[in-house]
């Protein structure tokens, strides 16, 4: 996990100030896959390479974030840099989480799940993390992961740790987290859907 993020960061840090500005402007109009939102213009234009990398990964996840970055770079005429980025991200991935049927290999890339759309708000606003952990334990979370999340001192840091595992999850794993949220913090889920 994190290889794609590092590759995006490497690519963006190698852009000149002018190229980074051009990258951001193109990102505002690049066609997006169905289900994905656009990074707000105001926030985008003031970001440095590190902030932009984090924003790309939180909005689009690592795989699609890297693909989107490569598309924009190619559109800017930076073919070699786009190629390097894609080469860096097309390397191995982790095992399927516990308790869920492992998917067959597929070229299809999934859209953005509700929990990925609202990652930042969930990190900030979920309060009963222990309840979520108990609901996910043995199905989605290993014992080691369960303990790692519990060891964090605050609810936001617990949720941040929990989200550090989600890039390895398939759609049904994410659905189990969403189910637990519907059960335990329904008002929050409703509020996020309205936002």
């Amino acid at each position: 996990m994190g290889r794609a993020r590092d590759a995006i960061l490497d690519a963006l840090e190698n852009l000149t100030a002018e190229e980074l500005k051009k990258f951001k402007l193109k990102l505002l109009s690049v066609p997006l896959r169905e289900g994905y939102g656009r990074i707000p213009r105001g926030a985008l234009l003031s970001m440095d390479a590190l902030d932009l990398t984090d924003k790309l990964v939180s909005f689009y996840l690592e795989t699609y974030g890297a693909e989107l970055t490569a598309n924009v770079l190619r559109d800017m005429g930076l073919q070699e840099m786009a190629g390097q980025l894609q080469a860096a991200t097309h390397q191995g991935s982790g095992a399927a989480p516990a308790g869920i049927q492992a998917p067959p290999q597929s070229a299809a890339k999934p859209g953005l799940h509700f929990i990925d759309q609202h990652r930042a708000a969930l990190i900030a606003r979920v309060t009963n993390v222990e309840w979520l952990l108990d609901a996910l334990y043995g199905k989605v979370l290993t014992d080691e992961q369960y303990q790692a999340v519990r060891a964090e001192p605050t609810n936001p840091s617990k949720m941040r740790k929990l989200f550090s595992f989600t890039p390895a999850w398939n759609w049904t794993c994410k659905d189990l987290l969403l189910q637990a949220l519907r059960e335990s913090q329904s008002y929050l889920v409703e509020d996020l859907e309205r936002s």
Partner: antibody, heavy 122, light 107 residues
Framework: QVQLQQSDAELVKPGASVKISCKVS????????IHWMKQRPEQGLAWIGY????????NYNDKFRGKATLTADISSSTAYMHLNSLTSEDSAVYFC???????????????WGQGTTLTVSS | DIQMNQSPSSLSASLGDTITITCHAS??????LNWYQQKPGNIPKLLIY???KLHTGVSSSFSGSGSGTGFTLTISSLQPEDIGTYYC?????????FGGGTKLEIK
């Protein structure tokens, strides 16, 4: 527009297996999960499970685990449900269905196939 | 599994009547409830989602209310095309479960 077209009615013998298909059009199969429902005559609806063709993962109702297997073929935009070791209890109408909106906080089923009638009889 | 108990199981009413169907969940499902209509020999059709939201293209004579464990579907000014069986379905927790259905007939 969105359409889900299911395979025709099946008459099979006890102990056999069957594969029901659900061909989608009007959207990309990988964009939404496909759920399956069972309805026996004069009885209500039962949720069998779903699969997400975008990554091939599936979630089953424990009551149908081992009975139903859900798969998809992206190249033909078709989802499948394989039912094995059939008995008269499996005789029913089976529906494939799709949540109405993508990336929602929960599933509500706005699109349905026309149903496939399965009759298990010797 | 969450049990969904629907009542009545059958109902006969006159044209123009207002009728109410109730659905009781065995545990709190918040607002994660859907209502469907199934006409004889046809497929289920979504009427209401999230307990009270009217699905696109559905007549405003249908309305839903409730949260937690108690929910109602109300049909005002009953029309001949409203005959069929109505089902509630909880969408909070897997496995999703349906009520047993309410068969509506016209007197």
């Amino acid at each position: 527009q969105v359409q889900l077209q299911q395979s025709d009615a099946e008459l099979v013998k006890p102990g056999a297996s069957v594969k029901i298909s659900c061909k989608v059009s009007g959207y990309a199969l990988t964009d939404h999960s496909i759920h399956w429902m069972k309805q026996r005559p004069e009885q209500g609806l039962a949720w069998i499970g779903y699969m997400y063709p975008g990554d091939g993962s599936a979630n089953y109702n424990d009551k149908f685990r081992g009975k139903a297997t859900l798969t998809a073929d992206i190249s033909s935009s078709t989802a499948y449900m394989h039912l094995n070791s059939l008995t008269s209890e499996d005789s029913a109408v089976y529906f494939c269905t799709r949540p109405y909106s993508f990336g929602s906080s929960y599933d509500y089923f706005g699109y349905w196939g026309q149903g496939t009638t399965l009759t298990v009889s010797s | 599994d969450i049990q969904m108990n629907q009542s009545p199981s059958s109902l006969s009413a006159s044209l123009g009547d207002t009728i109410t169907i109730t659905c009781h969940a065995s545990q709190n499902i918040n607002v994660w409830l859907n209502w469907y209509q199934q006409k004889p020999g046809n497929i289920p059709k979504l009427l209401i989602y999230k307990a009270s939201k009217l699905h696109t293209g559905v007549s405003s004579s249908f309305s839903g209310s409730g949260s937690g464990t108690g929910f109602t579907l109300t049909i005002s000014s009953l029309q001949p095309e409203d005959i069929g069986t109505y089902y509630c379905q909880q969408g909070q927790s897997y496995p999703y479960t349906f009520g047993g259905g309410t068969k509506l007939e016209i007197k």
